[in-house]
Interface confidence: medium
């Protein structure tokens, strides 16, 4: 499908508005520090030379790739040497190479201030002031943050954004009808940046075959009426949607995103009957919709797996003419019979049965070999059973504040070396996951659980990446995707760590703690109870739960004084010493 | 009634190319997958390609990949297949198959590719 000119193109299928916003999320992901201003300048500039290609596509340079315009762009930031220091090397690549090597500087971990709301009459005030200056803003504030957030998606929350607005500022109790909504969409964009933040792993870490291999398992689950070959063309497609995005093909990938939803709602009676509602939106919505649709009903004559994948004499000679499509039909065939399992649960048996055709294929009597593989599933099957059941268990005898404290206490005694900003944040999200799925029926516990899991411990590997301090993370996040969240289950106390000498300034505090936010008093705290932690690694449960509960209680009191500092600059040290006796 | 013709084949040398032909009557050939499935001489059945109704999906037999390709052209209703370095072992009978769900459900009659010097 080849066109004179790719950005005529893109502009012609995409239109102005979103091409614009495309265009903007992509430079604000590749130069995280740029001003606003400097990003709608190239935007601007880069979209009238698409309209001079629209009118006129063998006019100058209208033939030039996508990755050369836009790398030609950036590669015009005045600034670009002393805000970015060695990316600036990248200008002096050709394509392909220096967008390979502007990928590589993508920071996921970007020193950025956290994002001030303003008050809400602040916001409506810009909101009505100039509403495209206003959204442009929240696409260049959340991709600068985002690095590899899922541009398409990024312009349906954009959509929502500004539909929150207009409906907010005009209504009586603006704060009350704004807040909740803003909160909202900031918590599902932290997990929708999350979630394709693993996907973009699983494609630039561990190939295609491996993104591939999960999004049969979760199609199937979905769609597990849609025959094989059609979950197969869905995977397909959907790699080379994921493929784009993650290589900063923003506008290839949004395109071929709107062409899979087209295909999806154009062929539902082969795919799955919950997608009629998806298919009546527009657009952003439609592929949304289409992409969190709920598992269709499986259908109720699904025979044993057994008669095609253990008992039939044709296993190995199925398995010898094409591995990978009988190992991708096994995989269908397993996951779909399965929505109760994880994804993540459903590639490792996967991969156990790949193992056991290896072994067996080979053997002098194969079938006498694969016979029993199926009971060699039961250990895989139970192991994130009882970790799910265990954990929430512990979730409602705990709370999510309490359930946090105790992850927080298990990862730094696993891994103390990572820095403590890494063990709060990543604890604290693996904390989320009671609330997320405890309360879910059985049924959909493991799936919601250990797929987040997997998507929170990515984080802790993408931030572990940037800055290497453990081998055992490194092990367990470049050994196997798969076995990522069993490989830090099975981590123990890390006995080779040296503790880390006590410091009296980390365990100071001052008044200003008394105006935090809860949300902030919390991460203080835990921050606290991480550096506890990595001091006295052997201290058990009973005494850092002494040292946190006096924490409080000497906080709580300095918060009341009169004097809330002087309060604090007399207890303070008294705190430190009592900890230290108690920890002795 | 669903009815399938292959059509093609025939006697090549090794290293040779022939093209197969297959063509469907009675379903809605652009709704389903298609494929090719052959027969040696005294062995049993081998797939050897399927196509899904976009044309997009294809998946090949270890045994033929990088040297057979499928194709189809659902406004003729008809299904190909373009083989390529033909070799000794790939003599057999070729069938054009309709697959449905988990297995092929209507066969035509074959066509016989012989590859001999």
């Known amino acids: 499908d080849t066109h004179k000119s790719e950005v005529a193109h893109r502009f012609k299928d995409l239109g102005e508005e979103h091409f614009k916003g495309l265009v903007l999320v992509a430079f604000s992901q590749y130069l995280q520090q740029c001003p606003f201003e400097e990003h709608v300048k190239l935007v601007n500039e880069v979209t009238e030379f698409a309209k001079t290609c629209v009118a006129d596509e063998s006019a100058e340079n209208c033939d030039k790739s996508l990755h050369t315009l836009f790398g030609d762009k950036l590669c015009t930031v005045a600034t670009l040497r002393e805000t970015y220091g060695e990316m600036a090397d990248c200008c002096a690549k050709q394509e392909p190479e220096r967008n390979e090597c502007f990928l590589q500087h993508k920071d996921d971990n970007p020193n950025l201030p956290p994002l001030v709301r303003p008050e809400v009459d602040v916001m409506c005030t810009a909101f009505h002031d100039n509403e495209a200056t206003f959204l442009k803003k929240y696409l260049y504030e959340v991709a600068r943050r985002h690095p590899y957030f899922y541009a398409p998606e990024l312009l349906f929350f954009a959509a929502r954004y500004k539909a929150a607005f207009a409906e907010c500022c005009q209504a009586a109790d603006k704060a009350a009808c704004l807040l909740p909504k803003l909160d909202e969409l900031r918590d599902e964009g932290k997990a929708s940046s999350a979630k394709q933040r693993l996907k973009c792993a699983s494609l630039q870490k561990f190939g295609d075959r491996a993104f591939k291999a999960w999004a049969v398992a979760r199609l199937s689950q979905k769609f597990p009426k849609a025959e094989f070959a059609e979950v197969s063309k869905l995977v397909t497609d959907l790699t080379k949607v994921h493929t784009e995005c993650c290589h900063g093909d923003l506008l290839e990938c949004a395109d071929d995103r709107a062409d899979l939803a087209k295909y999806m709602c154009e062929n539902q009676d082969s795919i799955s009957s919950k997608l009629k509602e998806c298919c009546d939106k527009p657009l952003l919505e439609k592929s949304h919709c289409l992409a969190e649709v709920e598992n269709d009903e499986m259908p109720a004559d699904l025979p044993s797996l057994a008669a095609d994948y253990v008992e039939s004499k044709d296993v190995c000679k199925n398995y010898a003419e094409a591995k990978d499509v009988f190992l991708g039909m096994f995989l269908y065939e397993y996951a779909r019979r399965h929505p109760d399992y994880s994804v993540m649960l459903l590639l490792r048996l996967a991969k156990a049965y790949e193992a056991t055709l290896e072994k067996c294929c080979a053997a002098a009597d194969p079938h006498e070999c694969y016979a029993k593989v199926f009971d060699e599933f039961q250990p895989l099957v139970e192991e994130p059973q009882n970790l799910v059941k265990q954990n929430c268990e512990l979730f409602e005898q705990l709370g999510e504040y309490k359930f946090q404290n105790a992850l927080l206490v298990r990862y730094t005694k696993k891994v103390p070396q990572v820095s403590t900003p890494t063990l709060v944040e990543v604890s604290r999200n693996l904390g989320k996951v009671g609330a997320k799925c405890c309360k879910l029926p059985e049924a959909k516990r493991m799936p919601c659980a250990e797929d987040y899991l997997s998507v929170v411990l990515n984080r802790l590997c993408v931030l572990h990446e940037k800055t290497p301090v453990s081998e055992k993370v490194t092990k367990c996040c470049t050994e196997s995707l798969v076995n990522r969240r069993p490989c830090f289950s099975a981590l123990e106390l890390d006995e080779a760590y040296v503790p880390k000498a006590f410091n009296a300034e980390t365990f100071t505090f001052h008044a200003d703690m008394c105006t935090l936010s809860e949300k902030e008093k919390q991460v203080k705290k835990q921050t606290a109870l991480v550096e506890l932690v990595k001091h006295k690694p052997k201290a058990t449960k009973e005494q850092l739960k002494g040292v946190m509960d006096n924490f409080a209680a000497f906080v709580e009191k300095c918060c009341k004084a009169d004097d809330k500092e002087a309060c604090f600059a007399e207890e303070g040290p008294k705190f430190v010493a009592a900890s230290q006796a108690a920890l002795a | 009634e669903v009815q399938l013709l292959e059509s093609g084949g025939g006697l090549v040398q090794p290293g040779g190319s022939l093209r197969l032909s297959c063509a469907a009557s009675?379903?809605?050939?652009?709704?389903?997958?298609m494929g090719w499935v052959r027969q040696a001489p005294g062995k049993g059945l081998e797939w050897v390609s399927l196509?899904?109704?976009?044309?997009?999906?294809?998946y090949y037999a270890d045994s033929v990949k990088g040297r057979f390709t499928i194709s189809r052209d659902n406004s003729k209703n008809t299904l190909y297949l373009q083989m390529n370095s033909l070799r000794a072992e790939d003599t057999a009978v070729y069938y054009c198959?309709?697959?449905?769900?988990?297995?092929?459900?209507?066969w035509g009659q074959g066509t016989l590719v012989t590859v001999s010097s």
């Open positions: 009675g379903f809605t050939f652009n709704h389903y997958t």
């Open positions: 196509i899904h109704p976009s044309g997009t999906v294809i």
């Open positions: 198959a309709r697959w449905s769900s988990r297995a092929f459900d209507y």
